[in-house]
């Protein structure tokens, strides 16, 4: 999906009002310095692409983020403010994947959510020059 035509300000408002709080709740008990940010993004569409990937694509050691509150609210926001997002088709590879339904918080998931927080912060400051 191409995030170029999204209403970025509305998505930012949704992040600030709800999604950010859910991310903080997920990370509660974790020191903010515990993980290094290794994922970056260069502009708002790119940030949303990376956010979607980290939120919904299962990774080694963390297959369970998609059912978290912040993930569901992210999807709900994108569906409203990204034209055509809700019409996205599932490809054959996605359809064949067996997904775990159990919510398990692993250290790898905490690291992934820490990366997500960094991506969202970057999304909210689009005029900053890339470090």
């Amino acid at each position: 999906y191409d995030f170029t035509n999204c209403d970025f300000e509305k998505i930012k408002a949704a992040y600030l009002s709800t999604i950010s709080k859910d991310l903080i709740t997920y990370m509660s008990g974790t020191k903010s310095t515990e993980f290094n940010n290794t994922v970056s993004c260069s502009n708002r569409p790119h940030c949303l692409t990376e956010i979607q990937s980290l939120t919904f694509n299962p990774t080694a050691g963390c297959a369970s983020l998609a059912k978290e509150m912040f993930a569901m609210k992210t999807k709900a926001a994108l569906a409203i403010w990204c034209p055509g997002y809700s019409e996205t088709q599932i490809n054959a590879t996605q359809a064949m994947k067996k997904r775990r339904k159990r919510k398990v918080t692993t250290n790898k998931c905490l690291e992934q959510v820490s990366q997500l927080q960094g991506l969202w912060r970057r999304f909210n400051r689009p005029l900053l020059k890339q470090q």
Partner: nanobody, 117 residues
Framework: EVQLVESGGGLVQPGGSLRLSCAAS????????MGWFRQAPGKEREGVAT??????YYADSVKGRFTISADNSKNTAYLQMNSLKPEDTAVYYC????????????WGQGTLVTVSS
């Protein structure tokens, strides 16, 4: 199998109200993102309102007039539409998305809302 059945559409005068219902089967609402979308004649389908985990989001064009809600015990989502305008005339679709696929939604068959005097 996910099934969504909308009801509650019809003809209403400008300024009037309608409540759309979306009866869901094959899944439980609290595990899903639920949404209402609409398609006016000759236009693209657009998002109206979504709800997930208690969070609700609205398109600018309906904010303050429409309210989305979900009753988990009845496995039904609702769209309360107040202060309706002629430009709200459209086919309204209920949609649901299981958590695992980023942008994929399952769709109901739609219900027509006509706002006219």
């Amino acid at each position: 199998e996910v099934q969504l059945v909308e009801s509650g559409g019809g003809l209403v005068q400008p300024g009037g109200s309608l409540r759309l219902s979306c009866a869901a089967s094959g899944f439980t609402l609290d595990d899903y993102v639920m949404g209402w979308f609409r398609q006016a004649p000759g236009k693209e389908r657009e998002g109206v309102a979504t709800i997930a985990g208690g969070g609700t989001y609205y398109a600018d064009s309906v904010k303050g007039r429409f309210t989305i809600s979900a009753d988990n015990s009845k496995n039904t989502a609702y769209l309360q539409m107040n202060s309706l305008k002629p430009e709200d005339t459209a086919v309204y679709y209920c949609a649901s998305s299981g958590s695992y696929y980023p942008g994929h939604f399952e769709w109901g068959q739609g219900t027509l809302v006509t706002v006219s005097s």
